[in-house]
């Protein structure tokens, strides 16, 4: 195992020297630890501001965690010759706030990428596809880990964060071979509807600890290889029939639904029926009602249709009151219209007077506007009482 741990002051010199000449195949960058036997390079918690240029060609596993990279430009890992062996790249917790298009180009063996715990204010749509072609070359990525990449509110762009991530996942259909996608802890309020359709090979999808309220517009239908779907710790209130049928139709899937604020009213009946007969949901006896309060903590599996009621829109007594109120208001309206009709001549005369007064007033404004528009008369206008 070789190791380089020179002081940070010498790092820029080493970087520039390395870029001036081709790297030696087995040298170790400053501030990194290298093991050729394990094909691993670790540049961890070193406050690096850019990716080392002189990475050894043998590197298969590259850890660049806990740094201060800020921006990952296009071709951040492009080398000549290329890092043809690099299979696992971990950039978590490196204060990245921008990942540009083509950042991971020229890494032909890259199977696993972890960008977790970076406040990504900007993730290029072409970060993973590398080009803006409608269909780009397939990415070699099999595992993409994007947990907690949401930036703080003050660093967010105006556009939707969900939409930005979705665009990067679907661009050029590059990620059709992706097996694992982790998107936990990103404050997602919704899942853009076309995303999953573009990821047909997914086996593991983690959407836990987000703020998903509904899955109504999300389709899981074509995820025929999906084995694990993690939806714990969201804001799901109920799963509707369409979603239930899609999940039931996936041949290998296990779904995790713990810690959602299930609302146990009449809309929950279908989900309860499904839960009682499905083998898809893991730990289903841990699913309990959160609302309404009278049902709180009750186990969903132990609910019957008689337990699941919705408050009627209006109690019958109130309905009668509102009908009566409507009739009274209609009568008042009719009387008002009748009064207007009987006084139509007086109203017409009154309207003429109002119109004449307005015309005089507007002529005054028109005169004043002309004065203000003439730069020679500015002083006059400022003293004018018009």
């Amino acid at each position: 195992t070789s190791s380089a741990s020179s002081s940070s002051s010498s790092a820029p010199f080493l970087a520039s020297a390395a870029s001036a000449q081709p790297p030696l195949p087995d040298q170790c960058p400053a501030l990194c630890e290298c093991s050729e036997a394990a094909r691993t390079v670790k540049c961890v918690n070193r406050n690096l501001t850019e990716v080392p240029t002189d990475l050894p060609l043998y590197v298969r596993n590259l850890f660049l965690t806990g740094n201060q990279l800020a921006v990952l430009p296009a071709g951040a890992f492009a080398r000549r010759p290329p890092l043809a062996e690099l299979a696992a790249l971990n950039l978590s917790g490196s204060r990245l706030d921008e990942v540009r298009g083509g950042a991971f180009e020229h890494l032909p063996s890259l199977r696993q990428l972890d960008l977790s715990h970076n406040p990504l204010a900007y993730l290029s749509p072409f970060a993973f596809s590398g080009s803006n072609a409608s269909i780009s070359a397939p990415s070699p990525l099999v595992e993409l880990i994007l947990n907690h990449i949401v930036p703080p509110d003050d660093k967010r762009q105006n556009r939707s964060f969900e939409g930005m991530v979705a665009a990067a996942l679907v661009a050029g259909r590059a990620l059709q071979g992706l097996h694992l996608l982790e998107l936990a802890s990103n404050h997602f309020l919704y899942l853009p509807r076309d995303v999953l359709a573009q990821l047909p090979s997914l086996r593991y999808l983690d959407l836990s600890n987000n703020s998903l309220v509904s899955l109504t517009y999300v389709s899981f239908r074509n995820l025929t290889h999906l084995e694990s779907l993690h939806l714990e710790d969201n804001a799901l209130k109920v799963l509707h029939n369409g979603t239930l049928a899609e999940l039931q139709g996936l041949p290998h899937v296990r779904v995790f639904l713990d810690n959602n604020p299930w609302v146990c009213d009449c809309h929950m009946a279908d989900m309860v029926t499904w839960l009682k007969q499905t083998g898809v949901v893991q730990g289903k006896d841990r699913l309990t009602c959160a609302f309404p309060e009278k049902m709180r903590n009750r186990v969903l599996l132990e609910l019957n249709s008689a337990d699941l009621d919705c408050d009627p829109i209006l109690p019958p007594s109130l309905q009668t009151s509102y009908v009566f109120l409507g009739i009274v208001l209609a009568l008042i309206g009719a009387i008002f219209l009748l009064v207007l009709y009987l006084n139509r001549k007086g109203i017409k005369k009154w309207m003429h007077n109002i119109r004449d007064a307005c015309r005089d007033h507007m002529e005054g404004y028109h005169y004043r506007y002309e004065i203000n528009a003439d730069p020679r008369l500015t002083n006059l206008s400022s003293n004018s009482d018009v």
Epitope: S185, N209, D233, N259, P261, D285, R286, T288, A290, R296, N297, R298, V299, L301, E302, L303
Partner: antibody, heavy 116, light 107 residues
Framework: QVQLQQSGAELMKPGASVKLACKAT????????IEWVKQRPGHGLEWIGE????????NSNEKFKGKATFTADTSSNTVYMQLSSLTTEDSAIFYC?????????WGQGTTLTVSS | DIVMTQSQKFMSTTVGDRVSIICKAS??????VAWYQQKPGQSPKVLIY???NRYTGVPDRFTGSGSGTDFTLTISNMQSEDLADYFC?????????FGGGTKLEIK
């Protein structure tokens, strides 16, 4: 109304086992988890574990695995917690509570004293 | 395990005061927090669930707030019957854990 009635105080010798009972009334017994909580002076409240009576499913705090065992009898609407290999550290008030997320109804507590 | 910390073990107060009891979680628990009141010789009684929802029958002078890691139970107009221990609890993950408690005392 919902009530959880716990068995009376126990005085046990170190090394012995004890079975505490919690009888539930006023609601559908099988529809809610029953929680067990330990309280010692100066140690606050400690969650021991839980059981779903109708299904026998249990979850335990790792700290109490091997110490506490939960069972339920649906015919008498009673949940039991057995504590084994008692030591003086097990002297405490033990509460059962109905819950899962938060615990909305509590028993009056059973005081266990372990002393030689 | 998630550690719930109530740094003030004791708080002195007087009738009519506004009292804020603070609870900090060692990691993000969203709003999965409950607050309990325990009077001497009695079982705990739940006051608040989901960080800010008051249980039916709980006086409206009790309010809960917070999310993530910082939570507060506020008693807006302290009454003598509110003298008790107050505990927070997280239920986002196993094991369920409680804060060490804050005891309200009269000055």
């Amino acid at each position: 109304q919902v009530q959880l009635q716990q068995s009376g105080a126990e005085l046990m010798k170190p090394g012995a086992s004890v079975k505490l009972a919690c009888k539930a009334t006023g609601y559908t017994f099988t529809a809610y988890w029953i929680e067990w909580v330990k309280q010692r002076p100066g140690h606050g409240l400690e969650w021991i574990g839980e059981i779903l009576p109708g299904r026998g499913s249990t979850n335990s705090n790792e700290k109490f695995k091997g110490k506490a065992t939960f069972t339920a009898d649906t015919s008498s609407n009673t949940v039991y917690m057995q504590l084994s290999s008692l030591t003086t550290e097990d002297s405490a008030i033990f509460y059962c509570a109905r819950g899962y997320r938060d615990f909305d109804y509590w028993g009056q507590g059973t005081t266990l004293t372990v002393s030689s | 395990d998630i550690v719930m910390t109530q740094s003030q073990k004791f708080m002195s107060t007087t009738v009519g005061d506004r009292v804020s009891i603070i609870c900090k979680a060692s990691q993000n628990v969203g709003t999965a927090v409950a607050w309990y009141q325990q009077k001497p010789g009695q079982s705990p009684k739940v006051l608040i669930y989901s960080a800010s929802n008051r249980y039916t029958g709980v006086p409206d002078r009790f309010t809960g707030s917070g999310s993530g890691t910082d939570f507060t139970l506020t008693i807006s107009n302290m009454q003598s019957e509110d003298l008790a221990d107050y505990f927070c609890q997280q239920y986002t993950s196993y094991p369920r854990t409680f804060g060490g408690g804050t005891k309200l005392e009269i000055k």
